[in-house]
Amino acid sequence: EICGPGIDIRNDYQQLKRLENCTVIEGYLHILLISKAEDYRSYRFPKLTVITEYLLLFRVAGLESLGDLFPNLTVIRGWKLFYNYALVIFEMTNLKDIGLYNLRNITRGAIRIEKNADLCYLSTVDWSLILDAVSNNYIVGNKPPKECGDLCPGTMEEKPMCEKTTINNEYNYRCWTTNRCQKMCPSTCGKRACTENNECCHPECLGSCSAPDNDTACVACRHYYYAGVCVPACPPNTYRFEGWRCVDRDFCANILSAESSDSEGFVIHDGECMQECPSGFIRNGSQSMYCIPCEGPCPKVCEEEKKTKTIDSVTSAQMLQGCTIFKGNLLINIRRGNNIASELENFMGLIEVVTGYVKIRHSHALVSLSFLKNLRLILGEEQLEGNYSFYVLDNQNLQQLWDWDHRNLTIKAGKMYFAFNPKLCVSEIYRMEEVTGTKGRQSKGDINTRNNGERASCESDVLHFTSTTTSKNRIIITWHRYRPPDYRDLISFTVYYKEAPFKNVTEYDGQDACGSNSWNMVDVDLPPNKDVEPGILLHGLKPWTQYAVYVKAVTLTMVENDHIRGAKSEILYIRTNASVPSIPLDVLSASNSSSQLIVKWNPPSLPNGNLSYYIVRWQRQPQDGYLYRHNYCSKDKIPIRKYADGTIDIEEVTENPKTEVCGGEKGPCCACPKTEAEKQAEKEEAEYRKVFENFLHNSIFVPRPE
């Protein structure tokens, strides 16, 4: 039987009974938060062979092995993952071994086995036989291997039963527990699975099979399951479902959901039966089961019961996330906030149409309205008293409405009103009149020329750059010396710069009046010599990175015909030079024959340019004679090798430590102090652990019902 869509067993171990008849869990399996130690020996689920998503175990007291619970679990597909992992075993206080001796394949995702104080038999499992890539596995904070003394079946009797493989240059027996070997298929099967008797399964089988070369005898399917057969693709008139089986249209139409969006049911798209159309697509009609591409962002209509939605905080803006059409009026009143511009853009940036009016008042935190970056139509179906559909009053720091060179905004009905916006130049308002088609609608008092822009440099001259020079982490720029009518009015220059992967930034991006600014700022004093052009060296930059730079003249508020003159440059885009890439990551090597090594690695985290090739160097190393001095099959004879960790425990040293000259003296070497890079790596590691733990807690802890 198929169970699902995900099973969450918590608090009471007797809930495990829910797994009784399951052969496939279509979804995830959580077993967690069982704080009372129980005897699990009476619980056994031999029917369960496949979990299509992931398996998560967390704080289950008294559970010592998973092998008795799930003796036949063969495949975890990882169709959906838990924070990139298909198998998570976290803080299992009593778990002594994993013991999933029939687990043969984790199709997607990595494993995370962390903080299990009693857990052994981790180094005896060759995960590369189960997963495609082991480099993302995270196995940390479990019982130290030297305290485990893991022995595979038959090793003590000197009749080893398990097969050997090489992990990290260690050729060793592979097993799950003291009496269960890790199953390996004959090399003749290649990537295929095999039966218990080592006969190769059909290529469409995954994990194992009950008969050789038979696509109806698979324990699990490599691709898809349909009508008892494993198939490479779903047959005509059937559709992929949950990444593992084929279903017909009728089945898809009859799936019921508890999601609030279920009023229209599942859809069929691109050969798959899914809950809703994927990003960029929309249903072809309200009761349709099929999707068509959206023109631009997919429409999402949001409506405010009270007709007017007040945006006075990030929280209130959050309610509009994803909305493209807002039915009602927007009242924006943002007096303060942290990182407000980018937060508002995140939540309101998709709004294209407002059916009523837009009113912006007392929003002292706003420098620009560019957070409404897709607004293209204000219908003005409802208007403020005086027939206003765009109303801007008393915004002390508002300097820009939108970047009119890249913006089309239409106000279909109603007038505009602007008053008491001291930093908003009237020219900006006049430009909006032209773009929005409202020119001629406003009466004289609707745009106040005295109290809009009275504290801004509204007549701007253009500063021109004269030279630019780049290196891998520096940019040198110079510009024409600005000469206002009275040279004493020029105080200094401010250079603004930031990383800009694309040439689409504006001066007001990410900027608000509360200190948040995505631009870095540097003040540049005037050169004492009047003939020297001002310039700056920007350093500490990243190699092979495009930066946006512009310069502003800082002038006295010199009034000329009621206007303040200022000067600024256009935005200049400039790329730093390439540099040496950082080291390739996760280098792994393994031998697959007596004359070959396979070396794998991931690209460097900082390519610092376009990577064109890698250089691989190798050299032969002398064999370590130490390996031949002991009988490793006898447990009590295994010497414990302790590597330098800054201390030496005399009892554990089985032979005289090598002495080398260290710091000018003979004697055992101390561990070198950690380099900055190592300290940074440790810090990042700790941070990563915290992020995962937070994710885990946030995902699984739910408030008790009222």
């Epitope: 099973i7 089945f251 019921l256 959901s257 508890a258 609030s260």
Partner: nanobody, 123 residues
Framework: EVQLVESGGGLVQPGGSLRLSCAAS????????MSWFRQAPGKEREFVSA????????RYADSVKGRFTISRDNSKNTLYLQMNSLRAEDTAVYYC????????????????WGQGTLVTVSS
């Protein structure tokens, strides 16, 4: 977790009507797909009807289509089954079941079950 209690069963004549109720407690009711199953004496449990979390969509077994109507009231945490034109073969213990997130047409292993209420159709 979720507790389900059925009521409304009883003895009814062929052609008659009956309304079953299922009261739920313990978790947000609307986050579950709700179903009715039935088990006649000596037979396997069979699916009768199911309804989505919002109540906007439902499905029925062929044997009850047109005669039975499933509904839910999320404000009262209650599931209903209105049974009309009852037949002798409708005699069974009727179970209410809940499953989180969703339910596929072939799903039998629901997460939570009630104890059942007996419906007897006889003259």
């Amino acid at each position: 977790e979720v507790q389900l209690v059925e009521s409304g069963g009883g003895l009814v004549q062929p052609g008659g009507s009956l309304r079953l109720s299922c009261a739920a407690s313990g978790r947000t009711f609307s986050s579950f797909v709700m179903s009715w199953f039935r088990q006649a004496p000596g037979k396997e449990r069979e699916f009768v009807s199911a309804i989505s979390g919002s109540g906007s969509r439902s499905r029925y077994a062929d044997s009850v289509k047109g005669r039975f109507t499933i509904s839910r009231d999320n404000s009262k945490n209650t599931l209903y089954l209105q049974m009309n034109s009852l037949r002798a073969e409708d005699t069974a213990v009727y179970y209410c079941a809940a499953n989180p997130r969703r339910a596929t047409p072939d799903l039998i292993q629901y997460a939570y079950w009630g104890q059942g209420t007996l419906v007897t159709v006889s003259s």
